[in-house]
């Protein structure tokens, strides 16, 4: 049994880190493999993660961690029974992938404006809470070429767009993702999308 692509890990900088890797051939990840992880400091407790399959040769493991902090560094050992397949280390604060924003809502009752709001995925006690910026993707359900990205670089998780910039009588969808500039993170996954119907009509004089 051989590792084809070594584990790469990302952290949500809260309590979960996710590691993915590829094996040399089809593998029942949960039955055959274990990923052991241990905080690098004194004789910290060793934890075990049972991986799941992620495609035929891919494995993924969700490592539960007790409140990730900037000082933490973990050793990772990938075992197949008694055989050590790979050994590495992982510092969560240097490999952050933020949690996806939630509760994306579209408010169309404000005249001439479409207001999108969502929730910051972090609590205020987390440093990322005040460090996130967002990208909002809006697209026409009937015409995928009619798609746009709005960058939200201010802290408030809201976006206002003039309804007149969207086609009238069309259903649109929106989704949002986040990243943290100070940590040079990767982008989060996209939030679930939400749908609305743009019923805005231009005033008669402008037609």
């Amino acid at each position: 049994m051989k590792v084809l692509q070594e584990p790469t890990c990302v952290s949500d900088y809260m309590s979960i880190s996710t590691c993915e890797w590829k094996m040399g051939g089809p593998t029942n990840c949960s039955a055959e493999l274990r990923l052991l992880y241990q905080l690098v400091f004194q004789s910290s407790e060793t934890h075990t993660c049972v991986p799941e399959n992620n495609g035929g040769v891919g494995c993924v493991c969700h490592l539960l961690m007790d409140d990730v902090v900037s000082m933490d560094n973990y050793t990772l050992d990938l075992w197949a029974g008694q055989q050590l397949l790979w050994k590495g280390s992982f510092k969560p604060s240097e490999h952050v992938k933020p949690r996806a924003p939630g509760n994306l809502t579209v408010h169309t009752n404000v005249s001439d404006t479409v207001l999108l709001t969502w929730s910051n995925p972090y609590p205020p006690d987390n440093y990322l809470y005040n460090d996130l910026t967002y990208a909002v993707n809006i697209w026409n359900e009937n015409d995928l070429a009619d798609s746009r990205i709005h960058n939200v670089t201010y802290l408030k998780p809201t976006l206002r767009i003039p309804a007149s910039t969207l086609k009238s009588g069309i259903s649109y969808r929106a989704r949002v993702r986040a990243w943290a500039q100070h940590y040079n993170t990767t982008w989060s996954e996209w939030s679930p999308s939400t749908k609305w119907y743009n019923s805005y009509r231009e005033p008669f004089e402008q037609r």
């Epitope: 900088y13 809260m14 905080l39 690098v40 400091f41 910290s44 007790d66 409140d67 990730v68 902090v69 900037s70 000082m71 933490d72 560094n73 604060s93 240097e94 609590p123 006690d125 987390n126 440093y127 990322l128 809470y129 100070h182």
Partner: antibody
Amino acid sequence: QVQLQESGGGLVQPGGSLRLSCAASGFTFSSYSLTWVRQAPGKGLEWVSTIKARGGTTLYADSVKDRFTISRDNAKNTLYLLVNSLKPEDTAVYYCAKPLYNNLAGDFGSWGQGTTVTVSS
Amino acid sequence: DIQMTQSPSSLSASLGDRVTITCQASQSISSYLAWYQQKPGQAPKLLIYGGSRLQAGVPSRFSGSGSGTSFTLTIGGLETEDLATYYCQQDYSWPLTFGQGTKLEIK
């Protein structure tokens, strides 16, 4: 506002024990890692121990490991440090400290006023 | 363990002077560095975190810079109330470690 109030210090003989307490208010106690830092007379600051928010992870300086035990009671908003087998070099002011953010657990935005432990025969 | 070395260990400066204190880490700590001010008989007070981020309520004459292994605390124009000992501290890896301190006196 955040308040941290240490207590439990005193004069103790070498080999003796004390339990230091830090009563906290003004923030969601259970959300933060908390730390004890000490300062010997006329000396600099020395990290002693940290307990993570959920209490599952405790970390100690080599100089106190196996002698000191950090714990917390999230229901009482109180941090503790049980100090055993005390040595003269443990004589110091002991501060409890709270970070600005839970995951920047070493950036201490709030400190108590300190409690003095004197180890002498 | 990461060693933090401050220089100078003490310095004397006049009111209005620009004062610089440096902190050297024994290995790279990215920007995980904090600066504290401690006045006699008081608990330390956080001035700077993340290498350069000014803590709320701290006068803007204080600034921090640097990353990797070399860091600087600058006081733009020294005032009487700045008489204190200043400490740097890394929070990049366990164990947390402090510099030995720089005692600042007013000429």
